[in-house]
């Protein structure tokens, strides 16, 4: 992800007696929470791989970049970062790999400058629809978030409690239309089988969308038409068989787009003809010369760009009266 790393060379370590500070007390100017490292010069606090079970209450007010990775947080309650005075400068928050399984409504409230949030590598079985919007109003106050990194947040299959994981994530992205300003969204490695059709239309500012390493079979009902600012679309390592005319036309119509399609099991039959024609003409697909057929068996490993219409046939479907069992 693109969360910032600190350029600071000197970090002050915490004093044990500071661990008991409470959020209602204004932090001391040079205070650093227990088990964290702080650099006021770099406006950075790192509490990394320390098995923290809660967000420290005594974060310094100057913090702009906060790393809380590799901990044991489990739950982010409402107002997990609400402080008096507020953490008004906090712009980048990395919570990856902290064993979070529950993020409650309003978890990121009172962070007026928060632009980058990374929740990757947490098994988010319970992501509140209002985790990012903070309220259940039909239209919420706009979130300042510009970059949201949600790679590998899918819990184990037996822990999804019969809910649609895709639906849960999308509900959080769309609630209250709070994320209208979002420019980067990463949803890689989440076992997504489908993309709910309304999600992209409601994120009109997107520049970068990463859906790589999922299980997407089709984009037939997904519309990219409104994403006029989209610059990169990562669809590598999915289960895509073919892209149909409607999708091809929409992608071609996006002025700045680069599309990444490597490592999909393309089915090279008669339905692939339009896509092959498009690939030969388009400049939007990066590494298009690497795309190869996976099926049918006779076409395996053939390069899509080298196919012609004679190669792309469909076995005739026998009428029912002629079919054998």
């Amino acid at each position: 992800s693109s969360s910032p790393t600190s350029s600071a060379s000197s970090f002050s370590s915490s004093a044990p007696f500071l661990a008991s500070a409470v959020s209602a007390q204004p932090p001391l100017p040079d205070q650093c929470p227990a088990l964290c490292e702080c650099s006021e010069a770099a406006r950075t606090v790192k509490c990394v791989n320390r098995n923290l079970t809660e967000v420290p209450t005594d974060l310094p007010a100057y913090v702009r970049n906060l790393f809380l990775t590799g901990n044991q947080l489990a739950v982010l309650p409402a107002g997990a970062f609400a402080r008096r005075p507020p953490l008004a400068e906090l712009a980048a928050l990395n919570l990856s790999g902290s064993r979070l399984d529950e993020v409650r409504a309003g978890a990121f409230e009172h962070l007026p400058s928060l632009r980058q949030l990374d929740l990757s590598h947490n098994p988010l079985a319970d992501l509140s629809p209002f985790a990012f919007s903070g309220s259940n109003a039909s239209v919420s106050a706009p979130s300042p978030l510009v970059e949201l990194i949600l790679n590998h947040i899918v819990p184990p299959e037996d822990e999804r409690q019969n809910r649609s994981f895709e639906g849960m994530v999308v509900a959080a992205l769309l609630a209250g239309r709070a994320l209208q300003g979002l420019r980067r969204l990463e949803l890689a490695s989440n076992h997504f089988l489908y993309l709910p059709r309304d999600v992209l239309a409601q994120l009109p500012s997107l520049r970068h969308l990463d859906l790589s390493n999922n299980s997407l079979v089709s984009l037939t009902y997904v519309s990219f038409r409104n994403l006029t600012h989209l610059e990169s679309l990562h669809l590598e390592d999915n289960a895509l068989k073919v892209l149909h005319n409607g999708t091809l036309a929409e992608l071609q119509g996006l002025p700045h787009i680069r599309v990444f399609l490597d490592n999909n099991p393309w089915v090279c039959d008669c339905h692939m003809a339009d896509m092959v024609t498009w690939l030969k003409e388009t400049e939007v697909v990066q590494g298009k010369d690497r795309l190869t057929c996976a099926y049918p068996e006779k076409m395996r490993n053939r390069v899509l760009l080298e196919l012609n219409s004679a190669d792309l046939d469909c076995d005739p479907i026998l009428p029912p009266s002629l079919q054998t069992s």
Epitope: Q72, A74, P123
Partner: nanobody, 122 residues
Framework: EVQLVESGGGEVQPGGSLRLSCAAS????????MAWFRQAPGKEREFVAA????????RYAESVKGRFTISRDNAINTVYLQMNSLKSEDTAVYYC???????????????WGQGTLVTVKP
Amino acid sequence: EVQLVESGGGEVQPGGSLRLSCAASRRPFSSKTMAWFRQAPGKEREFVAAVRWIGGATRYAESVKGRFTISRDNAINTVYLQMNSLKSEDTAVYYCAAGQAWGTKFTDYSDWGQGTLVTVKP
């Protein structure tokens, strides 16, 4: 209501080890956290360790950090407490509990087992 059944208690010498088990009658989906508490004679029940069913996050009381390890096996709805370097002050009845919160308070947990006695003496 979930039935929680502890086992594995017994008598052990200082410095020895024991492994406690807590079997849940069914997976308590409403209870996201499993914990161990203990109660020594004449003292209040105190938090020992907790684990989340899903993410596997763990937390420990300061008095047992580095000596005790909590773990869970989701496939058989069982939580374990591996206790090493036991001390006489670890003598207590150990209770398994299930709850929603990620907390250390008695009131964070709604379902309780009957307890298993651990005695540490020379």
